[in-house]
């Protein structure tokens, strides 16, 4: 709990806490945190963890708290909670946090990772699926194919992470991706490393040819060596009785 | 610079009414309340009430109430303060001032008020 | 409403002195508490806010304390544009209340 006044949960409720237009924004936007109570309050505070006095505190009469926060910076980026007071309760009490809103104030969203599912190596006629994986929820994943200047597949996803299923003929490839806020206005992430998908192994493939080959000659002497052994054994037994080897 | 012009000093007659304005500059003006302070010759200060220009909500001090009416013009940034039923104990310098989010005031420069027959 | 007793009411001082102003509320206030400078003829001007936050462009020589219901004013050392006027302004409840006010004079 965030003051050690706080009642019970069911006595004082704890308000909601929401951000326009995003809870990730660039430098520079006008962010309004919106902190809405279950019944009229007098006052909203928002709280960043461990504070047991509110950072930015607004007076209303009603059940909602608007913050204006005018061109934020990163710095005023971070963990949130909003509570309440109203003038009938005891000096310093105040509601039940909201649940905690992250605000993330950035440039640019941390690059995110891209592997294949099972594995880079497509096997004839098998599909694969691509995992773009970055660190937020709710964000819109974009997946690109080299050579391709225009986006190969989207996806919004509520995890931090979107799959992008290929069809196995058309999935060798080099393929990058991002992620980027839903909504304006846009953050975007850097582009992941590159991953390259191709057919099993050529190479290997030889390999495998080759081998059978090998092994269908090793076969055939084999044949060729038996059918003589028998062809000899069998004339030794048909020759005159006196003459032996 | 976040600046409060107020309306420049008043003589009004007992009964009459008035109107006192404090145009906001500096900062978005409906991003923040806006407070209304009394100050009677050579005495301390008293709070009358605010208006969040955002939704024209306010709040008054109970000793206030009925006396001073809060209102906002948004396209002008501007509050008004309107006192009715004038009498000598109303005679006093009446202050504007900007609460932020951290617990900053800022002051306008006051407007006086002189209730005279 | 929450009563706001400042003390003193008055006081001289000495260019240079340190010099220490209280206001004790009726109740707590969880340290929303100004302090606040007038002088002759002009409007208040806030130097401290939350107990114990300078105001942008304030002396350093000007300093908050306290919590609860009991806080502090000091100037560590007067000058002569010192002298005016000092409130004390409590904002934890409704209606907000000032405290009678120091008039601090040079000696």
């Known amino acids: 709990d965030i003051t050690p006044s706080v009642p019970p949960a069911s006595y004082h409720p704890k308000p909601w806490l929401g951000a326009q237009p995003a809870t990730v924004v660039t430098p520079g936007v006008n962010v309004t945190l919106r902190c809405r109570a279950p019944q009229p309050a007098w006052r909203f505070g928002l709280f960043k963890p461990g504070e047991i006095a509110p950072l930015l505190f607004r007076d209303v009469s009603s059940e909602l708290a608007e913050f204006f926060l005018e061109e934020v910076t990163p710095a005023q980026g971070g963990s949130y909670r909003c509570c309440y007071r109203r003038p009938d309760w005891g000096p310093g009490v105040w509601s039940q946090p909201s649940d905690v809103l992250e605000l993330l104030v950035t440039e640019e969203l941390p690059r995110p990772s891209l592997v294949a599912l099972p594995g880079p190596v497509v096997g004839p006629g098998a599909n694969v699926s691509l995992r773009c994986a970055g660190r937020l929820r709710n964000m819109s994943f974009v997946l690109y194919r080299e050579g391709v200047a225009a986006p190969l597949q989207y996806r919004h996803s509520a995890q931090p992470w979107a799959d992008f299923t290929l069809l196995g003929a058309r999935a060798p490839g080099t393929y990058s991706c991002y992620y980027h806020t839903p909504s304006a206005p846009y953050v975007l992430s850097q582009r992941s490393e590159v991953l390259v998908i191709s057919w099993e192994d050529s190479g290997s493939s030889d390999y495998t040819r080759g081998n059978l080959v090998r092994l269908g000659l090793a076969g055939l002497v084999l044949i060729s060596l038996g059918a003589l052994v028998t062809f000899d054994w069998r004339s030794q037994n048909r020759a005159p009785a006196g003459i032996r080897p | 610079e976040i600046q409060l012009q107020q309306s420049g000093p008043e003589l009004v007659k007992p009964g009459a009414s008035v109107k006192v304005s404090c145009k906001a500059s500096?900062?978005?003006?409906?991003?923040?309340?806006m407070y209304w302070v009394k100050q009677s010759h050579g005495k301390s200060l008293e709070w009358i009430g605010y208006i969040d220009p955002y939704n024209g909500g306010t709040r008054y001090n109970q000793k206030f109430k009925g006396k001073a009416t809060l209102t906002v013009d948004k396209s002008s940034s501007t509050a008004y303060m309107h006192l009715n039923s004038l009498t000598s104990e109303d005679s006093a310098v009446y202050y504007c001032a900007r609460l932020d989010y951290y617990g900053n005031f800022y002051w306008g420069q006051g407007t006086t008020l002189t209730v005279s027959s | 409403d929450i009563k706001m007793t400042q003390s003193p009411s008055s006081m001289y001082a000495s260019l240079g002195e340190r010099v220490t102003i209280t206001c004790k509320a009726s109740q707590d206030i969880n340290s929303f508490l100004s302090w606040l400078q007038q002088k002759p003829g002009k409007s208040p001007k806030t130097l401290i806010y939350r107990a114990n936050r300078l105001v942008d462009g304030v002396p350093s020589r000007f300093s908050g304390s306290g919590s609860g219901q009991d806080y502090s004013l000091t100037i560590s050392s007067l000058e002569y544009e010192d002298m005016g006027i000092y409130y004390c302004l409590q904002y934890d409840d409704f209606p907000y209340t000032f405290g009678g006010g120091t008039k601090l004079e040079i000696k």
């Open positions: 500096g900062y978005v003006f409906t991003s923040y309340n």
